[in-house]
Interface confidence: low
Amino acid sequence: APRGTQAEESPFVGNPGNITGARGLTGTLRCQLQVQGEPPEVHWLRDGQILELADSTQTQVPLGEDEQDDWIVVSQLRITSLQLSDTGQYQCLVFLGHQTFVSQPGYVGLEGLPYFLEEPEDRTVAANTPFNLSCQAQGPPEPVDLLWLQDAVPLATAPGHGPQRSLHVPGLNKTSSFSCEAHNAKGVTTSRTATITVLPQQPRNLHLVSRQPTELEVAWTPGLSGIYPLTHCTLQAVLSDDGMGIQAGEPDPPEEPLTSQASVPPHQLRLGSLHPHTPYHIRVACTSSQGPSSWTHWLPVETPEGVPLGPPENISATRNGSQAFVHWQEPRAPLQGTLLGYRLAYQGQDTPEVLMDIGLRQEVTLELQGDGSVSNLTVCVAAYTAAGDGPWSLPVPLEAWRPGQAQPVHQLVKEPSTPAFSWPWW
């Protein structure tokens, strides 16, 4: 066997003591050794593992004048703010030439009031809706028993008898406070107090009651709000843009919503100033003194088409012999829907009015029958959508065409001589 493996006397003349205390305690462990010759560096072990970043100081005192005389070496390990991770068995380690020496162990223990690893957090919950709260504490000493309190009233007869780490609350109808007490052999620690704010439940059954081209009437069913009456509900509408793709529960639409407040009851609201024939998405939330409910999902709705708000513009009507030329331009006023076409009405003095559907053309040539002797012939034009006819233009008299007057280029149309479209008095 190699030389130097025989048991030699330990150089340690002072071993680490024991420290037991509560969290946050500051303490010092101390090793002392006496060696001959150059003093070694002292390393500290915790549970056999070398402490790489130990807060240690080493003091070396020569006992003689010669370097080869004995030295006293003192190493002190400082533990600041004692934590659970600091607990364990501590030893000093030195290398002296051919030997490794380890001191007798000292022990660091933690013992005090319970320490919270997790405490109940403030939160909001909907009225009458179940939720859970968490609380976790540890010693030492163990065991640690928990006691939950609601509005300062214990929820069990004794610590450890009720719910422990997780408290299930089946629902609240008023804003309440919760805390937990942690009990061990050293005493009691109380957690922070969590405030659980009771908000109204999300409204249900948001639906359309009636539709107009520029307004929608909507209604909903309010959710429970506990002991707090609802003060108002807020409705938001946003243009869907026919492909914006707001899905159920998707966060927020891309543009600023139109927001309206409704006094409640009734749980109904007329949304005005909307665009006709336009898809929207709407949602609603209701508010009590404690705060607002969550929003409902976005509901897709659509305003219906309306009739055009104005007549066609720049109507001209001229006659040249047996032909009448009428042309016009699209209304400047909003169409409130998809333009499907134009209706034309004409009437002579002392003759009944006749209606014609012109379609989407903006001019028509009529083949007049007879000698055209009917006097004071007037023409009116109206635009129409699927919702119906818009306002008629003022009557425009049929004027005789004069040579040199511009005449529109158009397709000649000979209207069929069915009873609806014949002018038998000409």
């Epitope: 056999g48 593992q49 070398i50 790489e52 380690l93 490794t100 380890v102 001191s103 162990p105």
Partner: nanobody, 121 residues
Framework: QVKLEESGGGLVQAGGSLRLSCATS????????MAWFRQAPEKERDFVGF???????YYDDSVKGRFTISRDNAQNTVYLQMNSLKPEDTAVYYC???????????????WGQGTQVTVSS
């Protein structure tokens, strides 16, 4: 019984390099302090250095800057890379485990059988 086996020793000229290996029979390398010692003829065994459980290394002043200790946890092996060797580095090199046990109260190491390193001038 845990065994340690050193290898890699031999004859080398001054200024040369050698790499010693220390293989263990159990998975102790990652959790124990592994140390290298050397014993020259007619002398006491001297401490060379150690590698701690977290991978930190500590060297004796006589080898600092020339020797490097490393560890391969997967192979349960510790290495001693020796560069710029000098004739005074001639010795039998031993590796040792400093046990990570709760009853560690004295100088009870587990030793290998050693490997001879000879540095010629």
């Amino acid at each position: 019984q845990v065994k340690l086996e050193e290898s890699g020793g031999g004859l080398v000229q001054a200024g040369g390099s050698l790499r010693l290996s220390c293989a263990t029979s159990t998975r102790t390398v990652s959790s124990a302090v592994m140390a290298w010692f050397r014993q020259a003829p007619e002398k006491e065994r001297d401490f060379v250095g150690f590698i701690s459980n977290s991978g930190s290394v500590y060297y004796d002043d006589s080898v600092k800057g020339r020797f490097t200790i490393s560890r391969d946890n997967a192979q349960n092996t510790v290495y001693l890379q020796m560069n710029s060797l000098k004739p005074e580095d001639t010795a039998v090199y031993y590796c040792a485990i400093i046990w990570r046990t709760s009853d560690l109260t004295g100088r009870f190491n587990t030793w290998g059988q050693g490997t001879q390193v000879t540095v010629s001038s």
